[in-house]
């Protein structure tokens, strides 16, 4: 039969031969012949492949370095890589999740819309008329002013979208 | 910071069973494989075989397939080796060395060791 | 599995002088490690992934290697690097040591 040009899914292509990949987790150590299957063996400690293929190393997994602010989120295994995340209060700079920023603060007059996970930067949003934010944060949202009407008090200074109003007791009328 | 902590040393008759413990402190030992090596007297090391705490999932050297057994509670972050039908080759100092993926260094830290003496 | 063999078994060395250890293993490994142990104590890692030096390590000390064959080299030998070190690989299991290399001082 004529020697194949192209091989099935799992397969490579080698000396006019398909021989099978090796599944995720196992390193090629002798492509197939005629008389003989491929032979693949486990990669070692701290190494993975996640593919079915013909690599002749495993990788190594990753470090997560505490230096850039990383930490484990899953170790390593023959068939995956490490899977970093950040340290409280930081967030990934990339999606591989190489290095980590601080959390950014919303700046007075602007609260937290979403607050920040280990892979998302704090989302900020403008206060809206009707609220302030008096402080720098990274979980705070924005407060309503208070209601002064409420306290059975007035406003005596209007509030902004950074002070909340201030309120003050009612002017009597003399009599 | 992290570290090892192993049980103390046992004296124990041929035929019997003995149950070594190997504490970690300073991680979480599911993010780590924990390691078992031999030392007999003034001889090398030896790998026995190691666990995945996240799942039991265990390996050993052939060699001690049926010798020994490496169990972990991680409610208390500590592994076990147990070691069955013991015999004077089962006399050496026992280590316990995690491969901790928060460290740079695989192996960098290890158990003081714990010795095991078989004799009648 | 794949077999370490270490040479020489013993060595010893003058305080200055520089030392190689070298590792053979039966089958190609991707990397090695070194630990280096005295009397009474547990090991320490010394050279991880072929030739990076573990924490606190001197920088006299140096490693190389690929494949089948790998070496631990002390560019200039001082008292305290008298020691028994072993070469060990995580490429394939079950895990496998070198019968250690017993450095001496002269």
């Known amino acids: 039969p004529e020697p194949p040009t192209a091989c099935r899914e799992k397969q490579y292509l080698i000396n006019s031969q398909c021989c099978s990949l090796c599944q995720p987790g196992q390193k090629l150590v002798s492509d197939c012949t005629e008389f003989t299957e491929t032979e693949c063996l486990p990669c070692g400690e701290s190494e993975f492949l996640d593919t079915w293929n013909r690599e002749t190393h495993c990788h190594q997994h990753k470090y997560c370095d505490p230096n850039l602010g990383l930490r484990v989120q899953q170790k390593g295994t023959s068939e995956t890589d490490t899977i970093c995340t950040c340290e409280e209060g930081w967030h990934c700079t990339s999606e591989a999740c190489e290095s980590c920023v601080l959390h950014r603060s919303c700046s007075p007059g602007f609260g937290v819309k979403q607050i920040a996970t280990g892979v998302s930067d704090t989302i900020c949003e403008p206060c809206p008329v009707g609220f302030f934010s008096n402080v720098s944060s990274a979980f705070e949202k924005c407060h309503p002013w208070t209601s002064c009407e409420t306290k059975d008090l007035v406003v005596q200074q209007a509030g902004t979208n950074k002070t909340d109003v201030v309120c003050g007791p009612q002017d009597r009328l003399r009599a | 910071e992290v570290h090892v902590k192993q049980s103390g040393a046992e004296l124990v008759k041929p035929g019997a069973s003995v149950k070594l413990s190997c504490t970690a402190s300073?991680?979480?030992?599911?993010?780590?494989?924990m390691h078992w090596v031999k030392q007999r007297p003034e001889q090398g090391l030896e790998w026995i075989g190691r666990?995945?705490?996240?799942?039991?999932?265990?390996k050993y050297d052939p060699k001690f397939q049926g010798k020994a057994s490496i169990t972990t509670d991680t409610s208390s972050n500590t592994a076990y080796l147990q070691l069955s039908s013991l015999t004077s080759e089962d006399t050496a100092v026992y280590y316990c060395?995690?491969?901790?993926?928060?460290?740079?260094?695989?192996?960098?830290?290890w158990g003081q060791g714990t010795t095991v003496t078989v004799s009648s | 599995d794949i077999v370490l063999t270490q040479s020489p078994a013993i060595m010893s060395a003058s305080p200055g002088e520089k030392v190689s250890i070298t590792c053979s293993a039966s089958?190609?490994?991707?990397?090695m490690h070194w630990f280096q142990q005295k009397p009474g104590t547990s090991p320490k890692l010394w050279i991880y992934?072929?030739?990076n030096l573990a924490s606190g390590v001197p920088a006299r000390f140096s490693g190389s290697g690929s494949g089948t064959s790998y070496s631990l080299t002390i560019s200039r030998m001082e008292a305290d690097d008298a020691a028994t070190y072993y070469c060990?690989?995580?490429?394939?299991?079950?895990?496998?040591f070198g019968a250690g290399t017993k450095l001496e001082l002269k």
């Open positions: 060395t995690p491969n901790y993926y928060g460290s740079r260094y695989p192996f960098a830290y």
């Open positions: 300073g991680f979480n030992i599911k993010d780590a494989y």
């Open positions: 666990i995945d705490p996240a799942n039991g999932n265990t």
């Open positions: 089958s190609s490994v991707s990397y």
């Open positions: 992934s072929t030739s």
């Open positions: 060990q690989q995580g490429s394939s299991y079950p895990l496998t």
